[in-house]
């Protein structure tokens, strides 16, 4: 059956039960993930805005699926197996009476069973399995999986030390509030914003100081380390990631198939073999594209190059080149470029810079 | 390359009944979803029916509910639909259809067949 | 059971031209909404699925959005190929179909 192909998994609870309060919810939900993290190499991160992996949704009757709930007891939730849309997805029936405790139907415990579903766990034959398909309470702070359930997901995902070996020396995690980190590409990504370096990212969400760094790997395994330029259409929920004369197309946080595919198919001549950095500007549904001390100007809608490209950075961006390392766009009216260890907020409607800062401020260094 | 074929489609006449078959390649058939969807001529699409990948899990449109029977053969790679009692309002192209792996169906059909014409009439 | 009404059931347009075709749910169906798009005597092809997610191999000019009643699929810049039927649906239930033609 189908698993997820990254250990980066991140899900979002749609709506909450008026049975319980929405921080017992919170709670409960986010236990059942650890439950399967701390038998695998999966991580799980809860967002609240945007396309989840796995959506959690407290429904009664039909609710868009083929599978209408049927009222009080009987069938309590489901989930889908991995996949993109509905895949992943976990649904528990709101005509229940939704506890965290023994009385009702605990939601921790049904969580656990459906997130299995959702991770690509099948029923067990097991009756002390938590993939059993019988609801049955158990005391929850005493609660472990059975060795029929570790056994069949680490069969899927492997066990937590696989995806934690150390990087290599000539590799290693940069420091993050090391004055001279540069960056190799920055974009935003819904609500996030992601800085690559080498093999890794940091994932910084807007206004909270908390950052964390991942393997480009973990997230997508299909992907090279190394990206060097990325910009995000956050209307269409794509974000396109470059290295060397290739891109890859990254859908609600997935990777198309079919790519890599050339960046000449935006229309570069021949000599261009590589992008520095790129910006989606949605006021005027452009991508900016630097190479080198140029760059051009792309129109999304037409899906072809503006005329009169490429121009110099220098000539058009007042106080920023010759050349750029990266560049995000945010808050609606601003460019950040980045410069080795340094950044500027770039001002594109008054066409000039700003503010002045290095490049890892967004991390409270 | 995933490919589905219809066939079995006809003229048939009133109460009588009909089997159209399915032959699929290009996929692990037993793990996916598959279903039937139609469409009367000139008309909108209609879904008929739907049957989990290992034929245990099966949902019928109340239109045709005890009437038709889907049922699959993974060993030969095939779909069925068994229509029977047919009725004038059953005339259209019957499309099966591709959904998704997993215990559950999503109604996401990723890939078609041409379609079969079956027509009901007297 | 959900309703889904799609709006308009006919539509004109010249080729450049943006269009946008809505679906609405009698309840909500979170973002599970696909979109396909039939041409005459051929199977429906898919080009949405889950509200806003591009299908692999359709041109990038189609865009889905919406979630809980409200779904949209907008083509930003019609081309010749592009005149056809197209179906919102969920689960067992599809939109009534609109028809875009050449004005």
């Known amino acids: 059956g189908p698993v997820w192909r990254k250990h980066y998994i991140t899900y979002r609870i749609n709506n909450y039960t008026p049975d319980m309060n929405r921080e017992d919810v919170d709670y409960a939900i986010r236990k059942a993930f650890q439950v399967w993290s701390n038998v695998t190499p999966l991580k799980f991160s809860k967002i609240n805005t945007g396309m989840a992996d796995i959506l959690v949704v407290f429904a009664r009757g039909a609710h868009g699926d083929f599978h209408a709930f049927d009222g009080k007891g009987g069938i309590l939730a489901h989930a889908f197996g991995p996949g993109s849309g509905i895949g992943g997805d976990a649904h528990f029936d709101e005509d229940e009476f939704w506890t965290t405790h023994s009385g009702g139907t605990n939601l921790f415990l049904t969580a656990v069973h459906e997130i299995g579903h959702s991770l690509g766990l099948g029923h067990s034959s097991d009756p002390k399995a938590v993939m059993f398909p019988t609801y049955k309470y158990v005391d929850i702070n005493t609660f472990r999986l059975s060795a029929d359930d570790i056994r069949g997901i680490q069969s899927l995902y492997g066990d937590p030390k696989e995806n934690q070996r150390l990087p290599n020396p000539d590799n290693s995690e940069p420091a993050l509030c090391d004055p001279n980190l540069s960056f190799d590409a920055v974009t935003t990504v819904g609500n996030k914003i992601f800085f690559f370096k080498d093999r890794f990212f940091w994932l910084k969400v807007s206004e909270r100081p908390k950052t964390s760094v991942n393997l480009i790997s973990s997230l997508w395994p299909t992907l090279p380390s190394g990206i060097e330029a990325a910009y995000e259409i956050e209307a269409r929920n794509q974000v396109f990631l470059f290295k060397d004369d290739k891109y890859w197309l990254i859908s609600n946080l997935r990777p198309e198939p079919n790519y890599p595919k050339s960046i000449h198919s935006f229309g570069f001549p021949n000599f261009v073999k590589k992008i520095d950095a790129a910006v989606f500007n949605p006021r005027f549904y452009r991508t900016y594209f630097f190479v080198d001390n140029q760059y051009w100007r792309y129109d999304e809608r037409r899906q072809m190059m503006d005329p009169g490209y490429p121009k110099l950075i220098t000539k058009n961006f007042q106080g920023i080149g010759p050349k750029i390392d990266a560049v995000f766009y945010s808050k609606n009216k601003y460019y950040y470029f980045f410069q080795g260890s340094n950044q500027f907020e770039y001002d594109f409607l008054l066409q000039r810079i700003t503010k002045t800062l290095k490049s890892n401020s967004w991390f409270g260094c | 390359e995933v490919q589905l074929l219809e066939s079995g489609g006809g003229l048939v006449q009133p109460g009588g009944s009909l089997r159209l078959s399915c032959a699929a390649s290009?996929?692990?058939?037993?793990?996916?979803?598959l279903h039937w969807v139609r469409q009367a001529p000139g008309k909108g699409l209609e879904w008929v029916s739907g049957?989990?990948?290992?034929?245990?899990?099966?949902m019928y449109a109340d239109s045709v509910k005890g009437r038709f029977t889907i049922s699959r053969d993974n060993s030969k790679n095939t779909l069925y639909l068994q229509m029977n009692s047919l009725r004038a309002e059953d005339t259209a192209v019957y499309y099966c259809?591709?959904?998704?792996?997993?215990?559950?169906?999503?109604?996401?059909?990723?890939?078609w067949g041409r379609g079969t014409l079956v027509t009901v009439s007297s | 059971d959900i309703q889904m009404t799609q709006s308009p059931s006919s539509l004109s347009a010249s080729v450049g031209d943006r269009v946008t075709i809505t679906c609405r749910a009698s309840?909500?169906?979170?973002?599970?909404l696909n979109w396909y798009q039939q041409k005459p005597g051929k199977a429906p092809k898919l080009l949405i699925y889950?509200?806003?997610s591009l299908q692999s191999g359709v041109p990038s000019r189609f865009s889905g959005s919406g979630s809980g009643t409200d779904f949209t699929l907008t083509i930003s810049s019609l081309q010749p190929e592009d005149f056809a039927t197209y179906y919102c649906?969920?689960?067992?239930?599809f939109g009534q179909g609109t028809k875009l033609e050449i004005k």
């Open positions: 259809a591709r959904d998704i792996v997993g215990p559950y169906s999503a109604g996401l059909f990723d890939y």
């Open positions: 290009g996929f692990t058939f037993s793990d996916y979803w």
């Open positions: 049957i989990s990948g290992s034929g245990g899990m099966t």
């Open positions: 309840q909500s169906i979170y973002t599970y």
């Open positions: 889950a509200a806003s």
């Open positions: 649906q969920q689960a067992g239930i």
